[in-house]
């Protein structure tokens, strides 16, 4: 619409303009959402990228607390593996966050298609093998450039895996490279934090990474609006439920 001014003086409206915004288009969008019976949408994408063998899939299974017996020997991911990670948020609002996790294959033959699936409304984990030293940090740069090109303001967390088999020299070299070349540097995306973990077992390091992922998800804003909990029409949620239930009926080899 072309409306640029929407005076609301003398109208006793119970609005919190801090969350809506004061521009006419923001107010109209909010009123439209109200009309459409809007509900909070506590779902967000978590994209896991990195080179082959860096431990992305194993890391994801540990983060999601998948049972050890379900892990077995890890075969290479084909294309992109998508799954839901439900998280209970223990705050005042007692809400459930669902991270829709996209585990990108690290093999080179998939590189050309991956960028098409990288979106703005997502949190990115860029994973590398810490035990291979600082060359691995360099090898992660093409992924970071792709994120910058497709989702420049999306938060990124760098994750160095194989902490259990890396020594002080390797850790020090990776830290130095990350600090000097990646953090707050032009040409790179918004790297919010970085962690070192052993992805094969539950640990203090893994718990801290999990906490960072949750915090970054809940605090991520696009145009000053929180992504998680954003109001969307109820019919969209219903449509999503129908599509998800239909997906269960699709044969696995499809």
């Amino acid at each position: 619409s072309k409306i640029w001014d929407l005076p609301l003086d003398e109208l006793h409206l119970n609005f919190d303009f801090k969350h809506i915004g004061c521009k006419a288009k923001d107010i109209i969008r909010f009123l439209q959402q109200r009309l459409k019976k809007a509900v909070p949408y506590n779902r967000m994408k978590l994209m896991i990228v990195g080179n082959t063998g860096s431990g992305k899939t194993t890391l994801l299974q540990q983060l999601m607390k998948t049972k050890k017996s379900d892990l077995g020997m890890q075969s290479a991911t084909v294309g992109i593996d998508v799954k839901d990670w439900p998280i209970q948020i223990r705050d005042k609002r007692k809400r459930d966050l669902v991270l829709n996790v996209w585990d990108f294959a690290g093999r080179e033959e998939f590189y050309s298609t991956h960028p098409h699936f990288m979106t703005q409304r997502a949190l990115y984990l860029a994973v590398y093998d810490l035990s291979k030293g600082q060359a691995e940090v360099d090898a992660m740069k093409p992924w970071l450039f792709n994120i910058k090109a497709r989702a420049s303001s999306s938060p990124v967390i760098l994750v160095g895996t194989h902490l259990d088999v890396s020594d002080e020299k390797q850790r020090k070299a990776c830290m130095s490279k990350i600090t000097k070349e990646l953090l707050n540097k032009r040409g790179f995306p918004a790297i919010r934090d970085y962690h070192f973990v052993n992805a094969t077992e539950e640990s203090d390091a893994l718990a801290k990474l999990r906490k960072t992922i949750i915090n970054e998800s809940l605090n991520f804003k696009i145009r000053d609006q929180l992504v998680v909990g954003q109001l969307i029409p109820d019919c969209y949620v219903e449509l999503e439920k129908i599509i998800l239930s239909e997906r269960k009926n699709v044969p696995i080899e499809f």
Partner: nanobody, 121 residues
């Protein structure tokens, strides 16, 4: 090689306060922690802070009394100790790990020489 130098120790009365400082050489912001060792006792963990200064860990006995913080521009980590008790008497050591967070899974890589804190009753 990272070098850690502690300062700020001394003699204080019970209920008093002290602020310990740990100055680090080098330009990488490591996770830093404080330990203490009382006479004839094991060295024990006190508090730790991550590279950015927004994630902290404390041992139960100091929670609510001690605060760890850092100033990355000065490459210094602080331990503010309030409501001191005689049982806080010990040599306080600063330690660093070549990691962004204080992960209990890995041992510290660097240690300072220590600073004596004595709390009299």
């Amino acid at each position: 090689q990272v070098q850690l130098v502690e300062s700020g120790g001394g003699l204080v009365q019970a209920g008093g306060s002290l602020r310990l400082s740990c100055a680090a050489s080098g330009d990488v912001n490591y996770a830093v922690g404080w330990f203490r060792q009382a006479p004839r006792k094991e060295r024990e963990f006190v508090a730790a802070i991550n590279w950015r200064g927004d994630n902290t860990d404390y041992t139960d006995s100091v929670k609510g009394r001690f605060t760890i913080s850092r100033d990355n521009a000065k490459n210094t980590v602080y331990l503010q100790m309030n409501s001191l008790k005689p049982e806080d008497t010990a040599v306080y050591y600063c330690a660093a790990k070549s990691a962004p967070y204080w992960y209990s899974d890995i041992a510290p890589d660097y240690w300072g020489q220590g600073t004596q804190v004595t709390v009299s009753s």
